[in-house]
């Protein structure tokens, strides 16, 4: 580990001397000196600085940008930002979440895996054999096939990933 | 009144290490940040490092951290600073100094002379 | 590492005479900035700390101004007795550093 410098925790060191950092919250005025303590004053309306520092200015909150599709998760405090989410049945297109694009459907032959939420997309998978899928869905997963035995009927038409058996009824000429 | 006395003056071989003491009185020991400074002949000042007494931390100048170990007794109100590896180059005064707001009282400084 | 440069490197005036420094940073420094009086044979003295507070004790024919990089000594009416090496010093980044110095010497 590094070790210890001349100022301890929540301080910094500025004109040979440790001042205290401004708590999350609030921003620095004025630094210490040798008679006077750090000055501090509470973020506004609207900003935030999440960590103990000796910043002049305060951060603005974020705004979630209902034209890009964004609504607001969390409200920010003084000590925290704003969360942007996106829209029902839209995704973050970043980890930042700046804007949102619709969800992606899984075409014919695909399924849905996992659904689509705020910050990621739909992901898709290929139906496997005996599964299928003949719509562009954003939820729908890999239907089973149809079993024919189960309902007394035979397999007239094989299955595809895009679409289901057909079923007929058995050759009554057969013992 | 502030007071800072130093050690005295050393002649050092190249390839030995030097040890400079600093008294402090006439303040709490703890409460201020210890500053060390040097000049060589004829020369400007040079920042070496500052030791914090109260709590042991320190920081030093990039240039001289691998040899340079700055210490504090608080029970003697004294502050220490040790170079080692000497070289020719390393022959100047050292000075140490109280912080708070600046190099706010200085040393009477420590000549140090490396010569073979 | 934020230089610093000291101008001049050293001037000659009359006792009365109004000398002025100046120091100039690399970067922004804001008002970090200290000025000192180096006596050959005595110990480094602080004139002025945060660019313009003069430390106590020290003759109120001493000031100093100026904030972000540029910034400027002042002795109103020289003296005999002020016949020194001054030099200028950051406190906003470590490492700390020192302009080259002015020599102030007497006509």
């Known amino acids: 580990p590094e070790p210890p410098t001349a100022c301890r925790e929540k301080q910094y060191l500025i004109n040979s001397q440790c001042c205290s950092l401004c708590q999350p919250g609030q921003k620095l005025v004025s630094d210490c000196t040798e008679f006077t303590e750090t000055e501090c004053l509470p973020c506004g309306e609207s900003e935030f600085l999440d960590t103990w520092n000796r910043e002049t200015h305060c951060h603005q909150h974020k705004y979630c940008d209902p034209n890009l599709g964004l609504r607001v998760q969390q409200k920010g405090t003084s000590e925290t930002d704003t969360i942007c989410t996106c829209e029902e049945g839209w995704h973050c297109t970043s980890e930042a979440c700046e804007s949102c694009v619709l969800h992606r459907s899984c075409s014919p032959g695909f399924g849905v895996k996992q659904i689509a939420t705020g910050v990621s997309d739909t992901i898709c998978e290929p139906c496997p054999v005996g599964f299928f899928s003949n719509v562009s869905s954003a939820f729908e997963k890999c239907h089973p096939w149809t079993s024919c035995e189960t309902k007394d009927l035979v397999v007239q038409q094989a299955g595809t990933n895009k679409t289901d058996v057909v079923c007929g009824p058995q050759d009554r000429l057969r013992a | 009144q502030v007071q800072l006395v130093q050690s005295g003056a050393e002649v050092k071989k190249p390839g030995s290490s030097v040890k400079v003491s600093c008294k402090a009185s006439?303040?709490?020991?703890?409460?201020?940040?210890i500053e060390w400074v040097r000049q060589a002949p004829g020369q400007g000042l040079e920042w070496i490092g500052v030791?914090?007494?109260?709590?042991?931390?320190?920081n030093y100048n990039e240039k001289i951290k691998d040899r340079a170990t700055l210490t504090a007794d608080k029970s003697t109100s004294t502050a220490y600073m040790e170079l080692s590896s000497l070289r020719s180059e390393d022959t100047a005064v050292y000075y140490c100094?109280?912080?708070?707001?600046?190099?706010?009282?200085w040393g009477q400084g420590t000549l140090v002379t490396v010569s073979s | 590492d934020i230089q610093l440069t000291q101008s001049p490197s050293s001037l000659s005036a009359s006792v009365g005479d109004r000398v002025t420094i100046t120091c100039r940073a690399s970067?922004?420094?804001?008002?970090?900035l200290n000025w000192y009086q180096q006596k050959p044979g005595k110990t480094i003295k602080l004139l002025l700390n945060?660019?313009?507070r003069l430390h106590s004790g020290v003759p109120s024919r001493f000031s100093g101004s100026g904030s972000g990089t540029d910034f400027t000594f002042t002795i109103s009416s020289l003296q005999p007795e002020d016949i020194a090496t001054y030099y200028c010093?950051?406190?906003?980044?470590?490492?700390?550093?020192f302009g080259g110095g002015t020599k102030v010497e007497i006509k």
């Open positions: 010093q950051q406190g906003s980044t470590l490492p700390w550093t």
């Open positions: 970067q922004d420094i804001s008002n970090y």
């Open positions: 006439g303040y709490a020991f703890s409460d201020y940040l």
């Open positions: 945060f660019a313009s």
């Open positions: 030791i914090n007494p109260g709590s042991g931390g320190s």
């Open positions: 100094a109280r912080g708070g707001g600046g190099f706010t009282y």
